[in-house]
């Protein structure tokens, strides 16, 4: 059974992930971002279901494509290089979902824009955090 200290650690990691995802979304949605139109042409893939930490596997699998798209606006909108930002997220995701999980992500048929993709995972983090508090 999860202890209060492990729950607290999970909550802190989720809050960190949430802040990173929100930072990316804010950078993209920045009214000065001339790249938004181009960024919106890139397709992202969403999980059919995202209600548990193991479902973060679906986020992990889309982190490389996310990094590629962030490279398009690398110097203007983010404090960190996309590679470092994604690397940080990857570390948190691996810790949260557990590296020993063999969960196979199932993806929804419809694609998403980068904004929809980030919003989906922000909502996921918020939802899990609310169950922990």
């Amino acid at each position: 059974a999860p202890t209060s200290s492990s729950t607290k650690k999970t909550q802190l990691q989720l809050e960190h992930l949430l802040l990173d995802l929100q930072m990316i979304l804010n950078g993209i949605n920045n009214y000065k971002n001339p790249k938004l139109t181009r960024m919106l042409t890139f397709k992202f893939y969403m999980p059919k279901k995202a209600t548990e930490l193991k479902h973060l596997q679906c986020l992990e699998e889309e982190l490389k494509p996310l990094e590629e798209v962030l490279n398009l606006a690398q110097s203007k909108n983010f404090h960190l290089r996309p590679r470092d930002l994604i690397s940080n997220i990857n570390v948190i995701v691996l810790e949260l979902k557990g590296s020993e999980t063999t969960f196979m992500c199932e993806y929804a048929d419809e694609t998403a824009t980068i904004v929809e993709f980030l919003n989906r995972w922000i909502t996921f983090c918020q939802s899990i955090i609310s169950t922990l508090t």
């Epitope: 893939y45 590629e68 490279n71 993806y107």
Partner: antibody
Framework: QVQLVQSGAEVKKPGSSVKVSCKAS????????IHWVRQAPGQGLEWMGW????????NYAQKFQGRVTLTADTSTSTAYMELSSLRSEDTAVYYC??????????????WGQGTLVTVSS | DIVMTQSPDSLAVSLGERATINCKSS????????????LAWYQQKPGQPPKLLIY???TGQSGVPDRFSGSGSGTDFTLTISSLQAEDVAVYYC?????????FGAGTKVEIK
């Protein structure tokens, strides 16, 4: 149709710089990234970097960081690749290229004819 | 960076025979979200720029003869020329088109036996 036309061959001295141009036609240069790829004589292909002509954003291969500068002039639909501190190993054909479509960054479907740069003392 | 290992270095095939070129990547090129492998194949003839033949591992580029086909997934890929023609003499390269920097294989020279 999409066409990328590059400037002519160049002979340069070691330590100098070279600037190669790539004129785009058949589409708006701001629609997509322009990549640069080089090929040394009898060797393979090596990606150097890309530029987004829309705003001048660049992404360089680590190997060329600090020595290559990619620029673009949207008024003339031309992209440029400048390589400085030339050495003999930079003797190569330099290509500009555009991706297959603008829904992903790679692969390269449209290529310039290539510009031979010879570095020799 | 992803390393692309191509084999063989060169290949001599009789006209009308099958030619097979392999390419192995150091990391998976499969994007599970769309089940696409981000691998492309190019043909290059002397004095010419490379020409895109296949992308997404198995999709033929428009205008490319259907004797050229691509297969494979994950880290192992193959380009097949089902019936070699004289105009197919060239160097063939694979390219991983998934992650920056994009990286090419060293090339396979195809000749007529």
């Amino acid at each position: 149709q999409v066409q990328l036309v590059q400037s002519g061959a160049e002979v340069k001295k070691p330590g100098s710089s070279v600037k190669v141009s790539c004129k785009a036609s058949g589409y708006s240069i701001t629609d997509d990234l322009i990549h640069w790829v080089r090929q040394a004589p009898g060797q393979g292909l090596e990606w150097m970097g890309w530029i987004d002509p829309e705003d001048g954003e660049t992404n360089y291969a680590q190997k060329f960081q600090g020595r290559v500068t990619l620029t673009a002039d949207t008024s003339t639909s031309t992209a440029y690749m400048e390589l400085s501190s030339l050495r003999s190993e930079d003797t190569a054909v330099y290509y500009c290229a555009r991706s297959l479509d603008s829904t992903w960054i790679y692969p390269f479907a449209y290529w310039g004819q290539g510009t031979l740069v010879t570095v020799s003392s | 960076d992803i390393v692309m290992t191509q084999s063989p270095d060169s290949l001599a095939v009789s006209l009308g025979e099958r030619a097979t070129i392999n390419c192995k990547s150091s990391q998976s090129l499969l994007r599970r979200g769309n089940q696409k492998n981000h691998l492309a194949w190019y043909q290059q003839k002397p004095g010419q720029p490379p020409k895109l033949l296949i992308y997404d591992a198995s999709t033929g580029q428009s205008g490319v003869p259907d004797r050229f086909s691509g297969s494979g997934s994950g880290t192992d890929f193959t380009l097949t020329i089902s019936s070699l023609q004289a105009e197919d003499v060239a160097v063939y390269y694979c390219l991983q088109s998934y992650i920056t920097p994009p990286t090419f294989g060293a090339g396979t020279k195809v000749e007529i036996k």
